[in-house]
């Protein structure tokens, strides 16, 4: 940013440098040769988050429960309200203007990362030796049952969707 005729936290108006209003305040009147910049605090439902010369404060974001939103952090005169999603939902976009249900991982897939208020469930295919037979937003792939440790033998091979079926060993006659 090239140097300008006014310092940081100042702005140029009518051939003079006026002080910007601090965060949380809006501009009422510019300075003159004889008076300082006049600023006023934002009202309770408004904010300004930078040094500014705005004549209007911004409205706090409304976390609309009809869109699945709730307040994560209440706004102040210097910060906007932060919304997050209700349990079981996550933000549709970075701006989090509405929420959608977490997706479930289908049979054959397990949960790699559980969803949060801002990110969806991440699924992964169950590798060989693991399976998932449910549609779930929480369950990871589970390992196939080890028939050997139970002194049993595999009667039916497992898949990514089914566990192995164990059975008794054939007795030798």
């Amino acid at each position: 940013e090239p140097p300008t005729a006014c310092r940081e936290k100042q702005y140029l108006i009518n051939s003079q440098c006026c002080s910007l209003c601090q965060p949380g305040q809006k501009l009422v009147s510019d300075c003159t040769e004889f008076t300082e910049t006049e600023c006023l605090p934002c009202s309770e439902s408004e904010f300004l988050d930078t040094w500014n010369r705005e004549t209007r404060c911004h409205q706090h974001k409304y976390c609309d429960p009809n869109l699945g939103l709730r307040v994560q952090q209440k706004g102040t005169s210097e910060t906007d309200t932060i919304c997050t999603c209700e349990e079981g939902l996550h933000c549709m976009s970075e701006s989090c203007e509405s929420c959608v249900p977490h997706r479930s991982c289908l049979p054959g897939f397990g949960v790699k990362q559980i969803a949060t208020g801002v990110s969806d469930t991440i699924c992964e295919p169950c590798p060989v030796g693991f399976f998932s037979n449910v549609s779930s937003a929480f369950e990871k792939c589970r390992p196939w049952t080890s028939c050997e440790t139970k002194d049993l033998v595999v009667q039916q091979a497992g898949t990514n969707k089914t566990d192995v079926v164990c059975g008794p060993q054939d007795r030798q006659r």
Partner: antibody, heavy 116, light 107 residues
């Protein structure tokens, strides 16, 4: 009382440079911006740029970027405008003025004539 | 850039007349409007800043008014020494811009 005194008329060759001075008195030099304005014969006023003598910060009219360079010397309460690569289009009267809620006090103007 | 328009480029009036010179900006300039007087010898003086604030030493027959994009300068009782060209200038947004000027002459 506030006074703004500019350097005298200049006759210069095309392609050369010229430096116009603007000496301020009767007030605290670093407390006010210095503005520069161009006036071609029989024409209106055109803003060139502004300098803050306190620390040398400037703003220029895009049209004069690369043409005009503004500087200031606090010790002598003098602002300067250098005009480079002069052409006949640069022939004009150049004014400096003290800022502070409009161009509050003007110099008498410096006539720059570019001619071979 | 904000364009400043002085529709009347020259104006003829008699001594003692009330004269009004107008100036229009291409957008709202929030009353950051200044008026200057340039005498025939080239000297320039600030008359009015911030639409209506009389600069020190300027006779009270000069006054300014306006808001938004429309402004005017009034000389209530024209005198011989008021023969000059009058320029408006906006100080709201860089680059500062001037009107084309209104040349005031005596009838």
């Amino acid at each position: 009382q506030v006074q703004v005194q500019q350097s005298g008329a200049e006759l210069v060759r095309p392609g050369t440079s010229v430096k116009v001075s603007c000496k301020a008195s009767g007030y605290a030099f670093t407390n006010y911006l210095i503005e520069w304005v161009k006036q071609r014969p029989g024409q209106g006023l055109e803003w060139i740029g502004v300098i803050n003598p306190e620390f040398g910060g400037t703003n220029y009219n895009e049209k004069f970027k690369g043409k005009a360079t503004l500087t200031a010397d606090k010790s002598s309460s003098t602002a300067y405008m250098q005009l480079s690569s002069l052409t006949s289009e640069d022939s004009a009267v150049y004014f400096c003025a003290r800022g502070g809620g409009g161009f509050t006090y003007w110099g008498q103007g410096t006539l720059v004539t570019v001619s071979a | 850039h904000i364009q400043m328009t002085q529709t009347t480029s020259s104006l003829s009036a008699s001594l003692g007349d009330r004269v009004t010179i107008s100036c229009r900006a291409s957008q709202d300039i929030s009353s950051h409007l200044n008026w200057y007087q340039q005498k025939p010898d080239g000297t320039v003086k600030l008359l009015i800043s911030y639409t209506s604030r009389l600069h020190s030493g300027v006779p009270s027959r000069f006054s300014g008014s306006g808001s938004g994009a429309d402004y005017s300068l009034t000389i209530s009782n024209l005198e011989q020494e008021d023969i000059a060209t009058y320029f408006c200038q906006q100080g709201n947004t860089l680059p500062w811009t001037f009107g084309g000027g209104t040349k005031l002459e005596i009838k």
